[in-house]
Interface confidence: low
């Protein structure tokens, strides 16, 4: 007798590993024999699709090599024309051992930056990712975290983070390890020991000592008054990523010596500098013996302070006077960043006019020193506190690069404007008068040791030092 189809073994959920075989069974009782069709996610599976095998009159569907895209709902439908068609459905859950789809790669990074080592994984159940550094599991902390993606993020990379890393993906089906990758941490060049300034007698030997570190180990070059060192012997040694350079000099003239440590990070370089001055005791010769020439100031640092097209004295005891004097004022200028807003413009004016002295052209170009009164005004009024601190530090030897020894004049040795008004230079940028000064807050308990000159206001003043001063 004809009998409508009945599915005697309903489809069940099938778990299958990738690349393995998965079979659904749909046992049907009916007469006549039914026609059985299969669907995946409601799309008909074609009989000639070579990825599948359909046997036992359609009752067995086999996926020959499971792919992760085979996940879904599979249904069999049986129909023999007697009664209605019957259907049974079951799910295929594709299980997958962990697989690392984006492994970590070697990284070179500069200390202090953020490093991310990728480790993207696949797997079902979703694998958890951990990391191994060297032979030990890597522990997370406030800087080091394993992200949800599995990537390793290291904030503010430190030297000790350098090493060999691998990620480990694990689920209930197995474990996958990435290849070992290298994290290299590069460190900007840094000077550990700066050369010290010396005040020596003419013809003596001096050794300047400069120590630097970095990864890769930096190279050290020495600059004398803005140019590569032309004389003197250099000895170098490297130990534990520290380079030690000693420059031995025979002193015949004062100079500014700069130690420059440089290392390379990819296409870029990092440099660190430290400078020392070599001054010669009894070097302050009479002005007429000064060797130099007059030229227009072409630098940058003193642009706002010196008069436009000012004629300044360039000292040929330096190999490159413009460069050396500019470097000198630049270094001293940096030390002024910390002084009070009352002191700073006055000190800048004093510095620039002292290092780039006004020049009197003639058969023998002569530098014109600053008038004593202006120097004392800066020292005892505008910068009283700062001057005291600086002198104290000088006595105690606290200045590492004693630039100020060259940069700050000794007021008492300067000529007074009352002796010969043409023998010394005024500071046009200190636009003060006795009326203005009365309103200044007291800077020191002692009165200035000089009567501050009553000068007409300078029309070319870039800034005025008064209760309401400005600087351009």
């Amino acid at each position: 007798l004809p009998k409508a189809p009945v599915i005697t073994t309903p489809l069940e959920t099938v778990d299958a590993l990738v690349e393995e075989v998965a079979t659904f069974m749909c046992a049907v009782e009916s007469y006549p024999q039914p026609e059985i069709s299969w669907t995946r996610n409601k799309i008909l599976i074609k009989l000639f699709d070579t990825r599948y095998s359909i046997r036992e009159n359609g009752q067995l569907l086999t996926i020959l090599s499971v792919e992760d895209s085979d996940d879904g709902i599979y249904c069999c439908t049986a129909n023999n024309g007697v009664g209605g068609a019957v259907e049974s459905c079951g799910a295929l859950q594709v299980k997958m051992k962990p697989k690392i789809t984006r492994p970590p790669i070697n990284v070179k990074i500069i200390e202090g930056l953020k490093a991310v080592l990728p480790c993207t994984t696949m797997g079902n159940p979703k694998p958890s990712v951990s990391w191994i550094k060297g032979d030990s599991p890597l522990r997370e902390n406030s800087r080091i975290a394993v992200l949800e993606s599995g990537s390793l993020r290291i904030h503010n990379v430190q030297k000790e983070d350098a090493g060999q890393y691998r990620c480990v993906a694990k689920n209930s089906l197995g474990t996958a390890y990435s290849k070992v990758v290298k994290l290299e941490v590069e460190v900007f060049a840094r000077i550990l020991r700066a050369p010290e300034s010396h005040n020596v007698t003419f013809g003596s030997f001096v050794t300047l000592h400069c120590t630097a570190t970095g990864i890769p180990v930096p190279t050290i070059t020495w600059i004398e008054n803005g140019n590569a060192v032309s004389s003197g012997s250099i000895q170098e040694s490297v130990k534990d990523r520290v380079i030690d350079s000693r420059l031995q000099l025979f002193i015949t003239k004062p100079g500014l010596y700069t130690c420059i440590a440089t290392n390379k990070h990819g296409e870029k370089f990092s440099t660190a500098k430290a400078a020392a001055t070599i001054s010669i005791a009894e070097w302050s010769k009479p002005q007429k013996d000064n060797k130099g020439y007059c030229a227009q100031y072409r630098g940058e640092v003193c642009n706002a302070v010196l008069a436009k097209d000012a004629l300044v004295f360039l000292n040929t005891s330096y190999a490159d006077p413009e460069e050396a004097q500019e470097l000198l004022v630049h270094t001293a200028w940096n030390e002024l960043k910390v002084v009070s807003p009352v002191c700073r413009p006055a000190a800048e004016a004093l510095l620039c006019n002292h290092i780039f002295q006004e020049c009197s052209p003639g058969v023998v170009p002569t530098p014109i020193p600053i008038c004593r009164e202006y120097c004392l005004a800066v020292k005892e009024l505008f910068c009283a506190k700062e001057w005291l601190v600086m002198e104290e530090k000088t006595h105690r030897g606290l200045y590492r690069s004693e630039m100020h020894l060259l940069s700050v004049p000794e007021c008492s040795k300067l000529p007074s404007m009352h002796w010969d008004p043409t023998a010394c230079a005024r500071l046009p940028h200190l636009d003060y008068n006795k009326e203005n000064l009365k309103t200044f807050p007291p800077m020191t308990s002692s009165k200035p040791s000089v009567d501050i000159p009553n000068l007409p206001s300078s029309s070319s003043s870039s800034f005025s030092v008064s209760p309401t001063y400005s600087m351009t």
Partner: antibody
Framework: ELQLVESGGGLVQPGGSLRLSCAAS????????MSWVRQAPGKGLEWVSA????????YYKESVKGRFTISRDNAKKTLYLQMNSLKSEDTAVYYC??????????????WGQGTLVTVSS | QTVVTQEPSLSVSPGGTVTLTCGLS?????????PDWYQQTPGQAPRALIY???SRHSGVPSRFSGSTSGNKAALTITGAQPEDEADYYC????????????FGGGTKLTVL
Amino acid sequence: ELQLVESGGGLVQPGGSLRLSCAASGFTFDDYGMSWVRQAPGKGLEWVSAIPWNGGSTYYKESVKGRFTISRDNAKKTLYLQMNSLKSEDTAVYYCAKRSGRIAFGALDAWGQGTLVTVSS
Amino acid sequence: QTVVTQEPSLSVSPGGTVTLTCGLSSGSVTSSNYPDWYQQTPGQAPRALIYSTNSRHSGVPSRFSGSTSGNKAALTITGAQPEDEADYYCALYMGSDIRNYVFGGGTKLTVL
């Protein structure tokens, strides 16, 4: 305030089963690995099991492997320890502990007050 | 099997300094073992003190410090207080498997 509260302990016969729970509050539960640590009466601490933030893998002390199952439900902010085939040597206070990072590996920086499991006939 | 070793008991006077050590029955303790230290007072749950050799957990007083010296990890209490009387446990990772997180037997510290 960060809190870990264990429950589910009690008296059970050898060969029996228990399921311990640990309810977490005061922190982002699904950002941290978790662990179970036990302490037999009058004895020291003993690490038992660990699970990372996403539950994707599990770790067990060799002597409990195959008998204990650690799991977590991040939606419910709860950690579980299913203990089967219990032995008298499993008698201990069981502490739930939070790890210091996402993975199962890390210092145990917060602990619950513990729940006592007694295995005895 | 390698065992994590600690002094069974130590005592210190209030205000004094004491050092607890954590070693291995064979081999040396290094920073790769990530030594952790826990404090447990009677009837209470353990509390984290030091992790990864020398990092203090938040809220832990500065008198507690960690280090490795010689072939052991060490916990030093400088200026011990009566409330520091407790059991102290160190824990080490033994190799690259997370299952090898092993606690020492503990040190009972008495503040006399």
